[in-house]
Interface confidence: low
């Protein structure tokens, strides 16, 4: 099962994430694919050169998780559909994370750059949209999931770097995976979190329920 650590769509007020510089990402009310009102972040400085716009989440506690998954819903404007757009227009953005033992971030720390931030991946849209028609909803919503780990400190921040695109970050959900507590074949298996790597197998030792007796050695 998936255990959510943070879901931007549940925000009832402003998300209040940190942006750098102020002329970059902007928090606005938007809509999800079901036309529900949600808080989103948008940036569209395609006609300005040398863009390097960062957006940082609030501190996310890892709650014992070793591997973190990030689901992003976003839309990207098709660069070629913007008249006279410069060649620096982008249809991608970067995802980063930074581990910390407590909520220590400020306007200037961690530095807004790769290292100390750890790059997870460059995120590209499967579908970009060419016309903005909020009435007809031409905008295409993409969903991408990325994971990273192992994480070992109390928590982490995520950052989204735009370097010259026209995009809307519609929803961010951060979660980890675990096997729930189950009773099977007379044994109780406690809740077990997934391993640090995507392919990790974690052995879960069961214990007998009341009036049950172990008759065989568990398979290793």
């Amino acid at each position: 099962v998936e255990e959510t650590l943070m879901d931007s769509t549940t925000a009832t007020a402003e998300l209040g994430w940190m942006v750098h510089p102020p002329s970059g990402w902007e928090e606005v009310s938007g809509y999800d694919e079901n036309m529900n009102t949600i808080r989103t972040y948008q940036v569209c400085n395609v006609f300005e050169s040398s863009q390097n716009n960062w957006l940082r989440t609030k501190f996310i506690r890892r709650r014992g998780a070793h591997r973190i998954h990030v689901e992003m819903k976003f839309s990207v404007r098709d660069c070629s559909s913007i008249p006279s757009v410069p060649g620096s227009c982008k249809e991608t953005f970067n995802l980063y994370y930074y581990e910390a033992d407590f909520d220590s971030a400020t306007k200037t720390f961690p530095n807004w750059m790769e290292n100390p931030w750890v790059k997870v991946d460059t995120i590209a849209a499967d579908e970009s949209f060419s016309q903005v028609d909020l009435g007809g909803r031409v905008m295409k919503i993409n969903t991408e999931v990325r994971s990273f780990g192992p994480v070992s400190r109390s928590g982490f921040y995520l950052a989204f770097q735009d370097y010259g695109g026209c995009m809307s970050l519609i929803a961010v959900r951060v979660f980890y995976r675990k096997c729930p507590r189950i009773i099977q074949n007379g044994a109780i298996f406690q809740e077990t979190l997934s391993g640090a790597e995507s392919t990790s197998l974690v052995a879960a030792r069961g214990s007998c329920i009341a009036n049950a007796e172990e008759v065989d050695v568990p398979i290793k």
Epitope: S80, S84, G87, G164
Partner: antibody, heavy 119, light 113 residues
């Protein structure tokens, strides 16, 4: 394999209009933008404009804005209509596809449609 | 519009010789975001449509012989044929793929002696 099959040669009178086609096969038509390029006899190449087949969005070289009209049909075919023809429009016209993000170039071209404008 | 200037306009070489042609753009074709140069080279043989040789200034298109090499950055670019063959008789065009309207150079015609 990828193919862009263009319609045959056209002979037209000054002032008339012509519509040429470019049928795509061997790839997902809506994943690439279709561009059109003009080449006059013994001359270089001139970019006319493009159409995004998934949305119908077009953008033109200002020089051809009142000359060319680009459209697409769901049958994997792109069209270019040239209006108010003059002898200056006599040329070979190529359709060519272009994918953004991976390659910044036009990787496959049609064989060309020759247009002759003559009274 | 970005103006692409190619030189020389033509050259005549013997099979096996090295050929170098230049392309200069009136504005930089370097994308600072991804450090890619949005420049392509095409080969056009008589009676045929252009064929993509090089994109991103230096990346050889699949199936293109390795005797063709693209180099350069910003505003100055070069296409080199290390050992020209008879089948390389063609006009070579560079293209600005950075800004609309896309523009092409006037071409360099390569003739084989």
């Amino acid at each position: 394999q990828v193919q862009l099959q263009q319609s045959g040669a056209e002979l037209a009178k000054p002032g008339a209009s012509v519509k040429m086609s470019c049928k795509a096969s061997g790839y997902t038509f809506t994943s690439y933008w279709m561009h059109w390029v003009k080449q006059r006899p013994g001359q270089g190449l001139e970019w006319i404009g493009f159409i995004n087949p998934s949305t119908g969005y077009t953008d033109y070289n200002q020089k051809f804005k009142d000359k060319a009209t680009l459209t697409v049909k769901s049958s994997n075919t792109a069209y270019m209509q040239l209006s108010r023809l003059t002898s200056e429009d006599s040329a070979v016209y190529y359709c060519t596809r272009r994918l953004k993000l991976l390659r910044y170039a036009m990787d496959y071209w049609g064989q060309g449609t020759t247009l002759t404008v003559s009274a | 519009d970005i103006v692409m200037t190619q030189s020389p306009s033509s050259l005549s070489v013997s099979a096996g010789e090295k050929v170098t042609m230049n392309c200069k753009s009136s504005q930089s074709l370097l994308n600072s975001g991804n450090q890619e140069n949005y420049l392509a080279w095409y080969q056009q043989k008589p009676g045929q449509p252009p064929k993509l040789l090089i994109y991103g200034a230096s990346t050889r298109e699949s199936g293109v012989p390795d005797r063709f090499t693209g180099s350069g950055s910003g505003t100055d670019f070069t296409l080199t044929i290390s050992s020209v063959q008879a089948e390389d008789l063609a006009v070579y065009y560079c293209q600005n793929d950075h800004s609309y309207p896309f523009t092409f150079g006037a071409g360099t015609k390569v003739e084989i002696k």
